[in-house]
């Protein structure tokens, strides 16, 4: 016999990302003896909760909690039994619940209470279900991206930690109901609400962040639909040959379409709406989502929101990735420059329904929404955030880094479990278990 060194014990953490359109569960793991190291926490597994987001259960809160059961049962299998009690479990809800909280705070509270009741039934260390602010969603996404890409600190060959010279990456998240932009900036923000000061591993970071509610992909599509009904009677962003029955109650139930809601409308009425494959009218429709008329600061992105000039490299994830990936992979279109992105959006918007279906087979009706989605992403980046060709060259569209989904969930867990210390790590001897 010979002595065999056992691998280090693993610790686990679970985050339920309760988005506007669906909920995802992420299970993270890390070696127990290296808790303060950077880049050491990784994704162990994930699970997509069937059905809509928890905000869609406003009239049936118990349905929200019931929907989580399948993934929670999977978590019981994925996390070793002896680790259950020590595994923190968090639920964070984002813009879908922020919207519900605006329109129906009682329903929002009921949904959170219902999911809390279910989550406490499991043997994990449940640490709460809450609605994240837009600022938190942006910052935690930024933390996730930079943690995974090891931009905060690294362990060098000489046995000491150092801060990489390459600086941090900006983060852009496009969710279902909101979109966030977050990046490190040198000068103080003119709008204090857009600035966050962070202390990570002994380093100080001044970060600009803003979340635009109602500018997530799904809400943008609803707003464009409302505009199309109002101004055209046809949808310029939908492909010619595609038509569907639109339930007015669905279009106008969101606070995001309140401004376009007619005085008197029958919520149960259905209107037939057809596409016209008109990229120019579609671009005009999308442009209407952004206001550049007034800015109370030295410079703004849109809607009077302060934003310093975009600087450095960025990672764009969630629906940014899915939209650009669709153009690149499914449509076979180049998207390496802003000009190419615009041309790709125009190309998709020119397609008839027959052409689009032939190019991308076996898809549900939301295939018809890729034109609007592409046009919105292109306009948001170029006109909204002010990326020029040079700055756009520094944007990478990514879904995962180091086999871990990029999003706010990991950053949220790292923060709440104190896995990123504020102080610099001291020198410590490492043990190689390979």
């Amino acid at each position: 016999t010979r002595d065999v060194r056992e691998p280090p014990a693993l610790k686990y953490g679970i985050v339920l990302d309760a988005g506007s359109s669906h909920t995802s569960m992420f299970i993270y793991k890390w070696p127990a003896d290296k808790e303060n190291d950077t880049g050491i926490v990784g994704q162990h597994s994930s699970c997509d909760v069937p059905g809509g987001g928890i905000s869609s259960y406003a009239d049936n809160p118990s349905g929200a909690s019931q929907s989580l059961v399948g993934c929670l049962e999977q978590a019981l299998q994925d996390v070793p039994k002896e680790r259950h009690a020590g595994t923190p479990l968090y639920l964070g809800a984002t813009a879908g619940m922020r919207l519900l909280n605006l329109t129906n705070p009682e329903a929002s509270t009921s949904v959170l209470m219902a999911v809390t009741h279910t989550l406490t039934q499991y043997p994990f260390d449940f640490r709460g279900a809450r609605i994240l602010s837009g600022q938190e969603e942006g910052v935690f996404g930024w933390v996730t991206a930079n943690y995974l890409l090891e931009n905060f600190i690294k362990y060098g060959w000489v046995g000491r930690w150092f801060r990489p010279r390459k600086g941090t990456l900006g983060a852009m998240d496009l969710g279902g109901a909101s979109t966030q932009i977050t990046f490190e900036t040198t000068s103080p923000a003119e709008d204090r609400a857009s600035e966050v000061q962070l202390h990570l591993y002994g380093q100080h970071y001044r970060v600009y962040t803003h979340s635009f509610l109602c500018y997530g992909r799904d809400q943008v599509l609803q707003r464009l639909l409302a505009s199309a009904l109002q101004t055209h009677g046809f949808h310029p962003c939908w492909p010619r040959g595609f038509s569907t029955q639109v339930l007015l109650g669905d279009v106008y139930q969101s606070p995001c379409t309140m401004a376009q809601r007619p005085q008197n409308f029958n919520s149960s009425a259905r209107v037939s709406l057809s596409g016209s494959s008109d990229p120019h009218l579609c671009r005009d429709l999308v442009s209407g989502l952004f206001s550049f008329s007034s800015c109370p600061f030295s410079r703004c992105s849109f809607n009077g929101v302060f934003q310093p000039p975009v600087a450095g490299n960025f990672v764009a994830f969630s629906a940014f990735f899915y939209t650009v990936d669709f153009l690149r992979t499914s449509m076979g279109l180049p998207v390496a420059t802003l000009q190419q992105l615009e041309a790709a959006a125009v190309n998709v918007c020119n397609q008839t329904w027959a052409q689009l279906q032939a190019r991308v087979p076996g898809q549900r009706a939301r295939l018809a929404d890729y034109c609007a989605g592409a046009m919105f992403v292109q306009q948001l980046l170029s006109r909204g955030y002010g990326f020029d060709e040079r700055a756009f060259g520094g944007v990478i569209f990514q879904k995962k880094a180091a086999d871990t989904a990029v999003g706010w969930a990991l950053g949220y867990m790292l923060n709440l479990t104190n896995l990123i210390p504020a102080d610099p790590p001291g020198l410590r001897k490492g043990t190689d278990f390979s």
Partner: antibody, heavy 120, light 108 residues
Framework: QVQLVQSGAEVKKPGSSVKVSCKAS????????VSWVRQAPGQGLEWMGR????????RYAQKFQGRVTITADESTSTAYMELSSLRSEDTAVYYC?????????????WDQGTLVTVSS | SYELTQPLSVSVALGQTARITCSGD??????VYWYQQKPGQAPVLVIY???NRPSGIPERFSGSNSGNTATLTISRAQAGDEADYYC???????????FGGGTKLTVL
């Protein structure tokens, strides 16, 4: 009633190429697409790539990228699949399948397939 | 990359109901197609868009799809239903058709 008719069985040496044809008899490729799917002996179905002749649009499975070329001649309603750098693992029945708009471009008409044997 | 998982084999008594599953991440968000393949023959489309039958396919064949599982149901199974069954779905992320590994249905 559209039928697909493929070329006959082939025996090829490792390292060589094979080109299989698929003709739509009793119809054209207008509004249709053609996929190529292979099946190794005793194995499952494996999608290789597709072409939308009327759009000149092709897509290939990553596994075959750079090794497979799918083309179509609209005038003769014939699709072709060429696979290069053949190895013994490429021994399989190669099917062409029509993708129809009526079925959201899933495979509604298949030919009986072409057996390609790769052997030294 | 996206994968579809099927049981290797399913057995059913003559006249009873057979259920063949096909699982994949959030498969309920995609359309699923089912193909029947008998020995020495080309595959035949039996279900498209989750639950629709092409003309000529008996009503005994039906499909469903939600969450992470799609199911092909064959009621009143007959000896002639013995075959390999494949589910398929289009993977938007890699722009490719994906087939499940196939399920051998045996009618006892």
């Amino acid at each position: 009633q559209v039928q697909l008719v493929q070329s006959g069985a082939e025996v090829k040496k490792p390292g060589s190429s094979v080109k299989v044809s698929c003709k739509a008899s009793g119809g054209t490729f207008d509004s249709y697409a053609v996929s190529w799917v292979r099946q190794a002996p005793g194995q499952g179905l494996e999608w290789m790539g597709r072409i939308v002749p009327w759009l000149g649009f092709t897509r290939y499975a990553q596994k075959f990228q750079g090794r497979v070329t799918i083309t179509a001649d609209e005038s003769t309603s014939t699709a072709y699949m060429e696979l290069s750098s053949l190895r013994s693992e490429d021994t399989a029945v190669y099917y062409c399948a029509r993708e129809s708009p009526g079925y959201r471009y899933s495979f509604d008409v298949w030919d009986q397939g072409t057996l390609v044997t790769v052997s030294s | 990359s996206y994968e579809l998982t099927q049981p290797l084999s399913v057995s059913v008594a003559l006249g009873q109901t057979a259920r063949i599953t096909c699982s994949g991440d959030a498969i309920g968000e995609k359309y699923v197609y089912w193909y029947q393949q008998k020995p020495g023959q080309a595959p035949v489309l039996v279900i498209y868009d989750d639950n629709n039958r092409p003309s000529g396919i008996p009503e005994r064949f039906s499909g469903s799809n939600s969450g992470n599982t799609a199911t092909l149901t064959i009621s009143r199974a007959q000896a002639g239903d013995e075959a390999d069954y494949y589910c398929a779905s289009y993977d938007l992320q890699q722009a490719r058709w994906v087939f499940g590994g196939g399920t051998k249905l045996t009618v006892l």
